[in-house]
């Protein structure tokens, strides 16, 4: 007994086409490009029906339905616009992802098309939505302002500045991504096994301001080469935050140095350091203070400290900054903060040093502040961030 002649569904075709279909004969359905086989709402990759001995097909005809990529994924810190038409998500529809301007940016152009495989796809063939990365290194601060020898920061000057509070200690750090803080290893060493006891505040100028953005650490990563209590080589650490912070005018990461940045940190080039550490009066600063200081000659700095503290080594992983005449320096309580430089090409601020150690007499003549040389640790930083 023959089976009824199969009729191809709209936007589909049948193969093979026969004059008659009898027991065990079969046909397959193929859809036009941009259409997919659906049985109800469930997709099929292929469809073949077999003629049974009672003269019926063993399964009903599917539909060839236009591919629907569905609503595009939400974009954190951005949004999506429908270009083809309101809520149109079918084959060849176009959408445009955009990031919140000023504070976030994306590497691609953000244009995605609904392709025949049912995925929103970028012009580069990427199936995953773009990422809105935080903009880094924007600041209202300009070099030239006359912490020890410092002056108060204004809103937006150092939006990467982070206050790290322990039960009895205070230090600083620099936001380098929306969920990573760069700091000195010595500043967080005691907290490495109890990260949750570290209180992280950002978006503030006044140290005791009640209007801060709170962040909590998930994990602390101390550089493997750092030995606590035995010098300050590799005095660098990363704090991963439990949650991403929202970037705005008062909270923004500082950039990491580009390979070419070494040329911007030569002797006598000026950097800026900010903190709530001890001031000339020997008291912790109430307001965030900053000072513009020049990079010191490395050999001169090494010689000063060899004489001052025999056995204390100024390594190639450190850079020194300050005036021979003294008067401008970072001090206790500033530890972990960023020594930043303006990249003239990008007009962005990058972190060149981390406040590490120095003379007991902050700001003394011929006694420079010593900073961890961040450019030496870019591979370490990138490795930690990409793996965790």
């Amino acid at each position: 007994r023959p089976c009824p002649d199969p009729t191809a569904p709209p936007n589909g075709s049948i193969s093979p086409v026969q004059a008659i279909y009898v027991l065990k004969d079969r046909f397959s359905v193929f859809c036009k490009t941009g259409f997919e086989l659906l049985q109800g709402s469930v997709p099929l990759k292929s469809f073949t029906a077999v003629c049974q001995k009672d003269g019926s097909w063993d399964r009903p005809m599917p539909e060839c339905s236009i591919i629907d990529c569905g609503p595009p994924d939400d974009l954190p810190n951005g949004h999506v616009d429908y270009i083809t038409g309101p809520e149109v998500t079918t084959y060849k529809a176009v959408i445009q992802y955009s990031c919140e301007e000023t504070f976030y940016t994306m590497s691609s152009n953000g244009k995605y098309v609904c392709e025949a495989d049912g995925f929103w796809t970028s012009s580069k063939g990427e199936k995953l939505p773009p990422v809105c990365e935080p903009v880094c290194g924007l600041s209202t601060h300009t070099i030239g302002g006359q912490i020890v020898g410092g002056q108060p920061a204004k809103p937006g000057d150092f939006p990467w500045q982070v206050l790290l509070l322990g039960q009895t200690t205070a230090a600083a750090g620099a936001l380098i991504h929306d969920n990573w803080v760069l700091t000195a290893a010595h500043a967080v060493y005691e907290k490495r096994m109890a990260a949750s006891s570290l209180n992280i505040r950002m978006g503030i100028l006044k140290r005791l301001s009640p209007h801060y953005t709170q962040a909590w650490p998930e994990e602390i990563f101390i550089h493997e080469g750092y030995t606590h209590g035995a010098g300050f080589d590799n005095d660098i650490a990363l704090i991963k935050l439990k949650n991403k912070v929202t970037i705005n005018g008062s909270i923004m990461p500082v950039c990491l140095p580009r390979k070419e940045a070494a040329s911007l940190m030569r002797t006598d080039f000026t950097g800026t350091v900010a903190g709530w550490g001890l001031t000339q009066k020997g008291l912790l600063a109430r307001n965030l203070m900053f000072v513009d200081i020049p990079i010191a000659d490395h050999q001169k700095c090494t010689a000063v400290y060899e004489k001052l503290y025999p056995g204390v080594r100024v390594s190639a992983n450190m850079l020194c900054a300050g005036l021979e005449t003294g008067g401008k320096d970072s001090c206790r309580g500033d530890s972990g903060g960023a020594l930043v430089f303006l990249d003239n090409e990008t007009q962005r601020w990058f972190v060149g040093g981390i406040v590490s150690w120095g003379s007991i007499n902050c700001g003394a003549a011929d006694q420079y502040g010593v900073y961890t040389k961040v450019i030496n640790y870019i591979p370490w930083i990138e490795n930690i961030i990409s793996n965790f």
Partner: antibody, heavy 114, light 107 residues
């Protein structure tokens, strides 16, 4: 012979993430069909949670959309369920199945309790 | 979402008799309906797909019919192994949904 087998912890604490894996043997999950997660709270009816299709596209029950992720590992011929922020209401027997439902796993009871 | 309403909730039938189970969809689902049998402590077993197509290996005493919003599962002559809970299921539109079940018990 197509077989599906669910695996994962039987006890999950409230607010944590429930994670289950379905291992498929006798058929490649990329060959065809959609691959479902379905659950059944004690004494209640079946609830479709979502599927991942042969191409890797997913479709979720809107009632769970903010909490559910279905993914796959084609090298192991497995597909997985993650359900975040669970509560006692997520206590159920969890099944994986192949659409049209012709093959099901034996089910695994997941209890949400502290 | 499409609500699938099954009736009766419980059906008492003697072995050898016919059982007729009803399932109503809250909106048109075409013929995209499946029927499952479930016994205590077991996973569901697929009986019928596309409203009236029997899965291979399913005895001929099970038959399905209907389209649109009204569907029926008929067991022509109940065997002892048929006493179980039966669910209908629509896969016409997301979210896919199931009926509350009909328990077929021995009279």
């Amino acid at each position: 012979q197509v077989q599906l087998q669910e695996s994962g912890p039987g006890l999950v604490k409230p607010s944590e993430t429930l994670s289950l894996t379905c291992t498929v043997s006798g058929y490649s999950i990329t060959s065809d069909y959609a691959w479902n997660w379905i659950r059944q709270p004690p004494g209640k009816k079946l609830e479709w949670m979502g599927y991942i299709s042969y191409s890797g596209r997913t479709s979720y029950n809107p009632s769970l959309k903010s909490r559910i992720t279905i993914s796959r590992d084609t090298s192991k011929n497995q597909f997985s369920l993650k359900l975040s922020s669970v509560t006692a209401a997520d206590t159920a027997v969890y099944y994986c199945s192949r659409h049209y439902g012709d093959y099901w796993g034996q089910g695994t009871l997941v209890t949400v309790s502290s | 979402e499409i609500v699938m309403t099954q009736s009766p909730a419980t059906l008492s039938v003697s072995p050898g008799e016919r059982a007729t189970l009803s399932c109503k969809a809250s909106q048109n689902v075409g013929t995209n309906v499946a029927w499952y049998q479930q016994k205590p402590g077991q996973s569901p077993r697929a009986l019928i797909y596309s409203a009236s197509y029997r899965y291979s290996g399913i005895p001929a005493r099970f038959s399905g019919s209907g389209s649109g919003t009204e569907f029926t599962l008929t067991i022509s002559s109940l065997q002892s192994e048929d006493f179980a809970v039966y669910f209908c299921h629509q896969y016409n539109a997301n979210p896919l949904t199931f009926g509350g079940g009909t328990k077929v018990e021995i009279k």
